[in-house]
Amino acid sequence: EEELQMIQPEKLLLVTVGKTATLHCTVTSLLPVGPVLWFRGVGPGRELIYNQKEGHFPRVTTVSDLTKRNNMDFSIRISSITPADVGTYYCVKFRKGSPENVEFKSGPGTEMALGAKPSAPVVLGPAARTTPEHTVSFTCESHGFSPRDITLKWFKNGNELSDFQTNVDPTGQSVAYSIRSTARVVLDPWDVRSQVICEVAHVTLQGDPLRGTANLSEAIRVPPTLEVTQQPMRVGNQVNVTCQVRKFYPQSLQLTWSENGNVCQRETASTLTENKDGTYNWTSWFLVNISDQRDDVVLTCQVKHDGQLAVSKRLALEVTVHQKDQSSDATP
């Protein structure tokens, strides 16, 4: 028969206050005969946690039926855990002796520590929007976890990010800890529908990490491109001019038409469409009254996007009987 080994598989057991802790212990042999007792700590001052034969241990139950023959499982459960229960627990095999049993072999011990789950990560983006090709910072915070060891990762659309800095506080011993991480993200023009994810993994989460998200739509401003065109066909004494405002975000936009420098107050037809990438297109039509005697008309489409400086695009109508081709130029 093989020599008896005491197996305590977990080096560390994290428990939550009020819950039940299971301390595992198995033996590999029935011999030598003698009881298995549980202690907290080592040496003369160790505390007896469980002795099946004698004593009263109201919070302790055995996982297996110890009265079953050939039982090799001496695992115990301790209910209603409090902070006072932390420490290292040892299952100890005694062998028969006279007049008292003699300690024969101890398990390696299981350290019981109080574990606390981290709070759901909160991700905050920049206070102001930024245009593509620029870098923005996102912060992620989670609080109240223990022990201190924790893993935090950042993702953008499922791709892991590497440009971030993380701090866990406090640095010394504490009942609970907090984590704060700042990630730097370069914005792409198509990021309106992108997400950044902060993922926190902790031993108390049993392999199921917590995630906090932020939408880049809250952080990005995609400025529009403008194009003003004149429709080739003329309807009576009216020419249709189109201002196409493309690929902008957010939707907040003001468009005004000017005719030879005078802002036109009359209604114009327009449509707003959303692109697959989440940006918008705005098309505005402007009908210009022309006559054969009339000289050049300069039309300006001015766009103010999301409170930024206005941008405009001009179109000079060269109106002849034969309706010459239009030409255009842009002004900031």
Partner: antibody
């Protein structure tokens, strides 16, 4: 003071089933294993098997295929059935308590019944 | 499975010390129990846990176990001690008895 009282048929024909019952008086029934032991005439003790209050059983491998041990906790009784008896099963049959003081490493048989003589003869 | 070997008989004069041995594999790692059985009576446990006496058993009964041998010692043997003696241990989940020793008080 715990006492064990046993009874059952004393004379059997070959191939019949031996049936004995043991009642526990004056003590706890749960928390112990309860054994059956036999002693052929002029020979030593042979352990047959045991049962506890929850019905967990263990048997002598040489008899296991023919033995049934059952328990009736409402009456504080346990019973032995030995099938297909032969003359070799002629013996004094004892019921006994296994002291539970030192689980899981088993204890001695500290209380015994008075014994029942069973003879198998055609 | 484990076997326990006892001498078939031991003789002793009254007042002398009788020793009955029981040998078996790794007995020193197991607990050994001793029973006394007088003719026509049920066995009585006289030693448990190698060397401990149940209540009511005279002090002259003593037990020991080490290595592969257990010993029942009866000091100042009396005529009333004449009986069969059986050692017993456990092999896994099975009770194992020795073959028994007839103690004769001359």
């Amino acid at each position: 003071q715990v006492q064990l009282q046993q009874w059952g048929a004393g004379l059997l024909k070959p191939s019949e089933t031996l049936s004995l019952t043991c009642a526990v008086y004056g003590g706890s029934f749960s928390g112990y294993y309860w054994s059956w032991i036999r002693q052929p005439p002029g020979k030593g003790l042979e352990w047959i098997g045991e049962i506890n209050h929850s019905g967990s059983t263990n048997f002598n491998p040489s008899l296991k295929s023919r033995v049934t041990i059952s328990v009736d906790t409402s009456k504080n009784q346990f019973s032995l059935k030995l099938r297909s008896v032969t003359a070799a099963d002629t013996a004094v049959y004892y019921c006994s308590r296994v002291d539970s003081g030192s689980y899981p490493y088993y204890d001695g048989l500290d209380v015994w019944g008075q014994g029942t003589t069973v003879t198998v003869s055609s | 499975s484990s076997e326990l070997t006892q001498p078939p008989s031991v003789s002793v004069s009254p007042g002398q010390t009788a020793s009955i041995t029981c040998s078996g594999d790794k007995l020193g790692d197991k607990y050994v129990y001793w029973y006394q059985q007088k003719p026509g009576q049920s066995p009585v446990l006289v030693i448990y846990h190698d060397d401990r006496r149940p209540a009511g058993i005279p002090e002259r009964f003593a037990g020991s176990a080490s290595g592969n041998t257990a010993t029942l010692t009866i000091s100042g043997t009396q005529a009333m001690d004449e009986a069969d003696y059986y050692c017993q241990t456990w092999d896994s989940s099975t009770v194992v008895f020795g073959g028994g020793t007839k103690l004769t008080v001359l």
